[in-house]
């Protein structure tokens, strides 16, 4: 089996308030099966931003068509960015189970929010 890697190519992304932020994430293997989730922050206080298994997440859309059976691109776009959205975002693969368990995390992408241009 090819070992699954999670690639978040951007260490940081800067977006003006009110715009959309694209956070990139690709995986290198479909296995083990289980959902992809995005979180802001780490540890017990982290905030769920997107879960492939459930929805909807009104401000979040996937960049690619995740219903394709071979899809490995789980990049997301977050609309109408505000300063409260600033933080480090992690793309995380979960392995199926009862409950699903965290399998591997991307390195994270830091989102910074610039003031809305006047």
């Amino acid at each position: 089996e090819e070992e699954l890697q999670i690639i978040q190519p951007d260490k940081s992304v800067s977006v003006a308030a009110g715009e959309s932020a694209i956070l990139h994430c690709t995986i290198t293997s479909l296995f083990p099966v289980g959902p992809i989730q995005w979180f802001r922050g780490a540890g017990p206080a982290r905030v769920l931003i997107y879960n492939q298994r459930q929805g909807p997440f009104p401000r979040v859309t996937t960049v690619s068509e995740t219903t394709k059976r071979e899809n490995m691109d789980f990049s997301i776009s977050i609309s109408n960015i505000t300063p409260a959205d600033a933080g480090t975002y992690y793309c995380i693969k979960f392995r199926k189970g009862s409950p699903d368990t965290e399998f591997k995390s991307g390195a994270g992408t830091e989102l910074s929010v610039r003031a809305k241009p006047s």
Epitope: E1, L30, F31, P32, V33, P35, Q52, R53, Q54, E65, T66, T67, K68, R69, E70, K96, S98
Partner: antibody, heavy 118, light 107 residues
Framework: DVQLVESGGAVVRPGESLRLSCAAS????????MSWVRQAPGKGLEWLAG????????YYIDSVKGRFTISRDNSENSLYLQMNSLTAEDTAVYYC???????????WGLGTLVTVSS | ALTQPASVSANPGETVKITCSGG??????YGWYQQKSPGSAPVTVI????KRPSDIPSRFSGSASGSAATLTITGVRVEDEAVYYC???????????FGAGTTLTVL
Amino acid sequence: DVQLVESGGAVVRPGESLRLSCAASGFTFSSYAMSWVRQAPGKGLEWLAGISAGGSDTYYIDSVKGRFTISRDNSENSLYLQMNSLTAEDTAVYYCARETWNHLFDYWGLGTLVTVSS
Amino acid sequence: ALTQPASVSANPGETVKITCSGGDWYSTYYGWYQQKSPGSAPVTVIHSDDKRPSDIPSRFSGSASGSAATLTITGVRVEDEAVYYCAGYDGRTYINTFGAGTTLTVL
């Protein structure tokens, strides 16, 4: 409520073609992958084909590849199955089904009967 | 191919377990589908190994481990008489496969 209603079933002769339709309502059709499943008389369920939410990617069981074509029209909330070169073995009730995020099924139509007979 | 028993029987109130084997836990998700008569619309009772749709009674539960999945009906009722099909989605082949079905008889 989610509703899937198949139509287009008929009695046809071997070698002829038929197009089945599935009208979807009660959910955002363009967000879901869809599948066709059939059941021959006295037999079990058999998955035939699936299609991604946007319609760009299709998947087939080997026995119908090249003869059957799955397609969709998201503007009409409709799923289709074009069946060519029909044989007696294609006699079955044909169901459309909505896929879950991981390509199983959550909602089913009532089915439409296709009879291939000379 | 997914393998399940051809038939099981139980008295009302008993617990029934139907197994489905032949998938690979690493790459397969399982679902269970109830069909009360041939040609009638199947009803999803479990998908994603253990997820029960909101309109399905809580006596239905699912689990998966190793190369097998199990549908459990705790406190079976007469109205649960049906054929139960397991299905698997294999992420290696992108193909869905059904078992041959298990006829549940409630005595």
